[in-house]
Interface confidence: low
């Protein structure tokens, strides 16, 4: 690629490149990876400015500005299944190279919660306008695209390449051209900082003459955190120009000798480095006295210094080291505060979720809301929790108290509910009578009926129509309270007795209905069943005082 055909900005310890291309986020990340980088991070306002600069370069390379919005992928993504966290600046997104808790963000608009698909972030640019330094591109989140379908308005992407350090650009003391080739395969002749391991090709001369010389240099680490080209003195010097061409390539002062030669010098408070071109501050910070991420600020005239901490940190008692500020001491959150390095985040207690005005507010989760109730029957939402309830005839059950279990009224603690036979049903019960007896209108007592040799009356199955000796004999009428929603009985007898419908016949039924032949254990011998004198009936012979029960599931209900 020819020099300056690519958009590249280097600053601090990283370089940023911007590229056109209608690609998915994954394809863009792959291209950055191929050259040893990632999709760009924007972890601070300073970094946002570098990214804006490289995008401005890219836009300048396009012949005309177009009247449309364009999006450029950066390396901020949220995996499928990970939900939005409104309390964090990054809202639960994280940088592809690592890092979730960076404090800077610049969202285009409030994010909508969606956990079901991977989401990616792009920078939103108005391509009809030149980029203004004060208006940093906003972050827009959306689907990550797929090969051949990058997503709406995706125009390109920004890569970031990190380095141990940077060399200063080579300064020429006479006519010539410098071309830098970076480790990420970009060539440029106008870098403000040149990354470690870059090569510099210096072609001296006017360009149209054959007297041009070429020099090659490599940006190396000369000492820990000290990077330079290993060149000595200004390059491409010419007696014809002396100090007049580019200040002789000198960083600060240029001193001419009488013979057309010249030397570089430095102003008070600075010293000339080994390259005989660059000046460095003769400052008290050169020994790096500040620790723990603190920045050393030299005092005036090269005397004294102060250490400054990044936001969210403060100097310790030594005034040299940075320690994390515990923002949680200020109680900035409604419920739970988690201190993090340089910041904090708010969390909500179990039974609450983020919400309500302001930062760190929590609101009650309505566990009983439609479709999310954990209760089998009734559910009541409470502040921070909930509780379950059961309809009449059921009791709470299960380890967590969310299930409802049928109460067997036939063996209830209040003693027999029926005067003779008792049938437990789901949520209720029915009464029945021994042969020769019929159920009284109160649905509980038995009265002497027509002489019959049939079995006890009052079967579990109300739908049954049985035939015996040519006649249809419907089951005994038994009834139980009907129930409304949330466990509210529509009609509940005060004595918990089954209700009898007015048109129900009182009769006996075939034995086969109650106990099909060969079905063991359903009934004890009829002789043990009894009626009481409540209806003026007499107790049959062999009167045992127990009450027989049968559950609807066909098991013996007597416990």
């Amino acid at each position: 690629t020819g020099a300056d055909t690519e958009a590249v900005v280097c600053a601090g310890t990283a370089c940023y490149t911007a590229h056109w291309g209608k690609l998915s986020a994954a394809e863009a990340q792959n291209l950055c990876l191929q050259n040893g980088g990632n999709l760009a991070t924007v972890k601070s306002e300073e970094e946002a400015q570098h990214v804006q600069q490289v995008l401005a370069q890219l836009l300048r390379r396009e012949a005309a500005l177009t009247a449309r919005m364009g999006k450029f992928w950066i390396g901020l993504q949220r995996e499928k299944g990970k939900c939005l966290d409104p309390s964090l600046p990054l809202k639960g997104f994280s940088w592809v190279g690592g890092g979730e808790d960076t404090p800077y963000s610049n969202w285009h608009k409030e994010l909508r919660n969606s956990c079901i698909s991977k989401r990616c972030v792009s920078l939103l640019l108005d391509l009809s306008q030149p980029l203004l330094p004060g208006r940093l591109p906003k972050w827009s989140e959306g689907p990550c695209g797929s090969p051949g379908s990058p997503g709406s308005n995706i125009e390109g992407f920004v890569c970031k390449f990190s380095f141990k350090g940077m060399c200063r650009p080579l300064a020429l003391g006479g006519p010539g051209q410098v071309t830098y080739t970076t480790p990420f395969q970009t060539t440029s002749s106008s870098l403000e900082a040149v990354p470690f391991a870059s090569a510099a090709n210096v072609a001296c001369g006017e360009g149209d003459k054959d007297d041009s010389q070429s020099h090659y240099f490599l940006c190396k680490e000369k000492a820990p955190d000290v990077f330079d080209w290993g060149s000595s003195g200004p390059l491409c010097v010419s007696p014809k120009y002396g100090c007049n061409f580019n200040n002789g390539g000198c960083h600060q002062d240029c001193f001419e000798g009488g013979d057309g030669s010249f030397l570089c010098g430095c102003r008070p408070g600075f010293r000339l480095l080994d390259d005989l071109v660059t000046c460095a501050s003769r400052n008290p910070c050169s020994s790096s006295p500040c620790r723990g991420g603190a920045t050393c600020i030299p005092g005036p005239h090269g005397k004294n210094y102060t250490c400054r901490c990044p936001q969210g940190y403060q100097l310790d008692s030594s005034q040299l080291d940075c320690v994390d500020v515990d923002e949680c001491q200020d109680s900035p959150c409604a419920q739970e505060c988690v201190n993090t390095p340089g910041s904090f985040r708010c969390e909500c207690w179990v039974g609450y979720e983020p919400g309500g005005p302001g930062e760190g507010a929590c609101q009650d989760v309505d566990e009983c809301a439609l479709g999310r109730s954990p209760c089998a029957q009734g559910c009541t939402n409470t502040e921070g929790s909930f509780h379950c309830s059961c309809e009449e005839g059921y009791v709470l059950a299960g380890e967590d108290g969310t299930q409802c279990q049928d109460v067997d009224e036939c063996v209830g603690p209040g003693g027999p509910l029926c005067d003779s036979l008792c049938f437990n049903t789901q949520g209720s019960f029915r009464c029945g009578c021994l042969p020769g007896w019929v159920l009284a209108p109160n649905g509980v007592s038995c009265a002497m009926g027509p002489v019959s040799l049939g079995p006890p009356s009052g079967p579990p199955d109300e739908e049954y129509k049985g035939e015996r000796e040519g006649s249809t004999v419907p089951p005994a009428a038994t009834a139980s309270p009907t129930r409304g929603p949330e466990g509210t009985p529509k009609s509940t007898p005060t004595t918990r007795r089954p209700l009898l419908s007015s048109d129900a016949p009182i009769t006996s039924v075939p034995l086969e209905v109650l106990a099909p032949s060969g079905s063991p254990g359903l009934w004890r011998e009829p002789s043990i069943h009894h009626t009481t004198a409540a209806s003026g009936a007499q107790e049959p012979a062999g009167g045992d005082s127990s009450v027989a029960t049968q559950n609807d599931d066909g098991t013996d209900g007597q416990k």
Epitope: P89, P103, Y104, S105, N106, W107, H108, K109, E110, Q311, G312, V325, E327, D330, S331, P332, C333, A334, G342, S343, F344, G356, P357, G358, E359, G360, A361, Q363, D364, E383
Partner: antibody, heavy 116, light 107 residues
Framework: DVNLVESGGGLVKLGGSLKLSCAAS????????MSWVRQSPEKRLEWVAT????????YYLDTVKGRFTISRDSAENTLYLQMSSLISEDTAVYYC?????????WGQGTLVTVSA | DIVLTQSPATLSVTPGDSVSLSCRAS??????LHWYQQRSHESPRLLIK???QSISDIPSRFSGSGSGTDFTLSINSIETEDFGMYFC?????????FGAGTKLELK
């Protein structure tokens, strides 16, 4: 220590404009929501506007919507309230507040007087 | 908008007395209610957050209670520095609103 210092108040004509500033120090400004709250001469407190920690969300009292703009400069640790089309009901002491659980910290206030 | 009604408007007490200030919301605000004190010629300061949660550096004689629509600020054994205005504020929904205040004055 948390410190909030308001400035920019003064006497302004009906329909005029004014920009209030609030210099914040002693805490990580970019971590917190910030608000403006005003107090009328009758001592009634009224919330005016809130801005989220990164500046991407703003909320306004209905009566100031479209006339007031809340903004922040995290590099300068400064909160702003640009007021225009001022009416007599806007006369009040304007407080800059840091929002956490309620209005956790308040400045000393700056008086805005709207005259006919 | 949620309206907060404070009562009484004025309360005359002597140091050593204990008092209860009431704040009633026009609709349920759960526990999203905060209390502020404003002494003469000073800015308001947060006393109680979320109806009953104490704030560091605020004397323990100040306490809050209530949930839903009815809230109370209690001051146990009033001291001279406690005289001034007391405001309640809700953060349940936008717009954030304040009560008109209760003035606590020396009898």
């Amino acid at each position: 220590d948390v410190n909030l210092v308001e400035s920019g108040g003064g006497l302004v004509k009906l329909g005029g404009s004014l920009k209030l500033s609030c210099a914040a120090s002693g805490f990580t400004f970019s971590n917190y929501y910030m608000s403006w709250v005003r107090q009328s001469p009758e001592k009634r407190l009224e919330w005016v506007a809130t801005i989220s920690n990164n500046g991407d969300s703003t909320y306004y009292l209905d009566t100031v919507k479209g006339r007031f703009t809340i903004s922040r400069d995290s590099a300068e640790n400064t909160l702003y309230l640009q007021m225009s089309s001022l009416i007599s009901e806007d006369t009040a002491v304007y407080y800059c507040t840091r929002v956490g659980t309620g209005f956790t910290y308040w400045g000393q206030g700056t008086l805005v007087t709207v005259s006919a | 908008d949620i309206v907060l009604t404070q009562s009484p408007a004025t309360l005359s007490v002597t140091p050593g007395d204990s008092v209860s200030l009431s704040c009633r919301a026009s609709q349920s605000i759960n526990n999203y209610l905060h209390w502020y004190q404003q002494r003469s010629h000073e800015s308001p300061r947060l006393l109680i957050k979320f109806a009953s949660q104490s704030i560091s550096d605020i004397p323990s004689r100040f306490s809050g209670s209530g949930s839903g629509t009815d809230f109370t600020l209690s001051i146990n054994s009033i001291e001279t520095e406690d005289f001034g205005m007391y405001f309640c504020q809700q953060s349940n929904s936008w717009p954030l609103t304040f009560g008109a205040g209760t003035k606590l004055e020396l009898k």
